[in-house]
């Protein structure tokens, strides 16, 4: 006569996180008397998942009615699967006793959990940088399984190639994280640009997740200055303008100096926006020529976004 066999027909089962996993187990005999227990892992540290005889296992239900008289099906369903549930599950027959003794184990079923990666988070440098500089962007996504994942970087739809990606941990784990750093060279036209990190994974069914960073948060385009003298408005008054062009962000303070002495300070307010997202602004100064016997040196001094001031001067001729 054949001894009882514990049959676990599935070598492996793959389940999406949040779903239920069905682990199949049948026995070939009702002899000996004693319970079926399910464990995750083997050896002394194995974790009890279900005991037919006793205990409360809120996430586990038996697939067939375990109290049914001739029941030999001890398959279980585990609800709300998370990556932490991954592992090899063993269906084990125990023989009634004090204590119950292990009689025979099934071959085990490996449960792998398909978990979606979290939405990629893209972060840029802490400080703004100017065009022609190279800046680094990082992209992070967590909690996915299996380990295989694809990450791509784009700038305005164009794929970037200068990046480095790591998936951690290197060994076996219930879930994984990806970290990637991309290098981007800034141009003056990048105020409206976007950097996109795209993550593709088996759980996403061909619909990758994207994280974005706007270069408007990263770039600083310093202004160009031009000081010009306008035709005389009145007999002894001259209008001098300072054109502040192509700057970003808007935060800008302008100071007029007459022969090195502060004449007026103002903050950029009514700016005009260019197509590329940069701003233009103009300030003017009315100079009373009759108050000066000698030539006047007018300086337009601009402090942009907390950076050291830049200036442009204009010499105003005073005719005797």
């Amino acid at each position: 006569e054949e001894e009882l066999q514990v049959i676990q027909p599935d070598k492996s089962v793959s389940v999406a996180a949040g779903e239920s996993a069905i682990l199949h187990c049948t026995v070939t005999s009702l002899i000996p008397v004693g319970p079926i227990q399910w464990f995750r892992g083997a050896g002394p540290a194995r974790e009890l998942i279900y005991n037919q005889k006793e205990g409360h296992f809120p996430r586990v239900t038996t697939v067939s009615e375990s109290t049914k008289r001739e029941n030999m099906d001890f398959s279980i369903s585990i609800s709300n699967i998370t990556p932490a549930d991954a592992g090899t599950y063993y269906c084990v027959k125990f023989r009634k006793g004090s204590p119950d003794t292990e009689f025979k184990s099934g071959a085990g079923t490996e449960l792998s959990v398909r978990a979606k990666p979290s939405a990629p988070v893209v972060s840029g440098p802490a400080a703004r940088a100017t065009p022609q500089h190279t800046v680094s962007f990082t992209c992070e996504s967590h909690g996915f399984s299996p380990r295989d994942i694809t990450l791509k970087w784009f700038k305005n739809g164009n794929e970037l190639s200068d990046f480095q990606t790591n998936v951690d941990p290197v060994g076996e784990s219930v879930s994984y994280s990806i970290h990637s750093t991309a290098k981007v060279v800034l141009t003056r036209e990048d105020v409206h640009s976007q950097v996109i990190c795209e993550v593709a994974h088996v759980t996403l069914q061909g619909d990758p997740l994207r994280g974005t960073a706007n270069l408007s948060e990263t770039i600083r385009v310093p202004p160009t200055l031009e000081v010009t003298q306008q035709p005389v408005r009145a007999e002894n008054q001259v209008n001098v303008t300072c054109q502040v062009r192509k700057f970003y962000p808007q935060r800008l303070q302008l100071t007029w100096l007459e022969n090195g002495n502060v004449s007026r300070t103002e903050t950029a307010s009514t700016v005009t926006e260019n197509k590329d997202g940069t701003y233009n602004w103009m300030s003017w100064l009315l100079v009373n020529v009759s108050a000066h016997r000698d030539d006047v040196k007018l300086t337009c001094q601009v402090e942009h976004d907390g950076q050291p001031a830049v200036s442009k001067s204009h010499d105003l001729k005073v005719s005797a």
Partner: antibody, heavy 115, light 111 residues
Framework: RQLVESGGGLVQPGGSLRLSCAAS????????ISWVRQAPGKGLEWVGT?????ITYYASWAKGRFTGSKTSSTAYLQMTSLRAEDTAVYYC????????????WGQGTLVTVSS | DIVMTQSPSSLSASVGDRVTITCQAS????????LAWYQQKPGQAPKLLIY???TLATGVPSRFSGSGSGTDFTLTISSLQPEDFATYYC???????????FGQGTKVEIK
């Protein structure tokens, strides 16, 4: 589905007897067969359960004198060193107890131990 | 060995009555639920009614029910029928495989 016992009868004290329990309509391969006896006018008494191979167990008073065995279709109870107090109707039943209760019973066979 | 004590040893009741029989184990039964109830009529083999303390066996009328856990168990017949006059036995299993004991029986007679 039924169990039919045979082999009962009159035996002298110290003698031996072999009871048979034939199953029809199902196989005994995956089930235990338990033996239960009932002395005249008394209650039920569990004798032992025959499983497979080494998986056989008996009431403490039956150990050493009673031995069970089975094939896929028939179970046996070999009784030795019989005493007057072993006089009873012997039933075989399919099952091993706990979640495998005694659900099918034979009609019983009377064993009388007397000189 | 586990000892099963049934009470009462006999009772008289009428058709339609609610009948309760108790069975007490000398120690907790295996798994707290290794307790079955059997019905036996004169000249017949016993018949399984309830197992695992409260699971109704196939084909048994729903007027029979079992309850209890550990050491104290009850068989209830909600409305006694003429065919229910018989002797009822509990069978308890201890923690050892070779520890199965019947109660002494409760005879239900017609009043």
């Amino acid at each position: 589905r039924q169990l039919v016992e045979s082999g009962g009868g009159l035996v002298q004290p110290g003698g031996s007897l072999r009871l048979s329990c034939a199953a029809s309509g199902f196989s005994l391969s995956s089930h235990g067969i338990s033996w239960v006896r009932q002395a005249p006018g008394k209650g039920l008494e569990w004798v032992g359960t025959i499983g497979t191979g080494v998986i056989t167990y008996y009431a403490s008073w039956a150990k050493g004198r009673f031995t069970g065995s089975k094939t896929s279709s028939t179970a046996y109870l070999q009784m030795t060193s019989l005493r007057a107090e072993d006089t009873a109707v012997y039933y075989c039943a399919r099952g091993s107890a706990w979640n495998d209760p005694f659900d099918y019973w034979g009609q019983g066979t009377l064993v009388t131990v007397s000189s | 060995d586990i000892v099963m004590t049934q009470s009462p040893s006999s009772l008289s009741a009428s058709v339609g009555d609610r009948v309760t029989i108790t069975c007490q184990a000398s120690q907790s039964v295996y798994g707290n639920n290794d307790l079955a109830w059997y019905q036996q009529k004169p000249g017949q083999a016993p018949k399984l009614l309830i197992y695992l303390a409260s699971t109704l066996a196939t084909g048994v009328p729903s007027r029979f029910s079992g309850s209890g856990s550990g050491t104290d168990f009850t068989l209830t017949i909600s409305s006694l029928q003429p065919e229910d006059f018989a002797t009822y036995y509990c069978l308890g299993g201890g923690d050892d495989e070779a520890d199965n004991t019947f109660g002494q029986g409760t005879k239900v007679e017609i009043k």
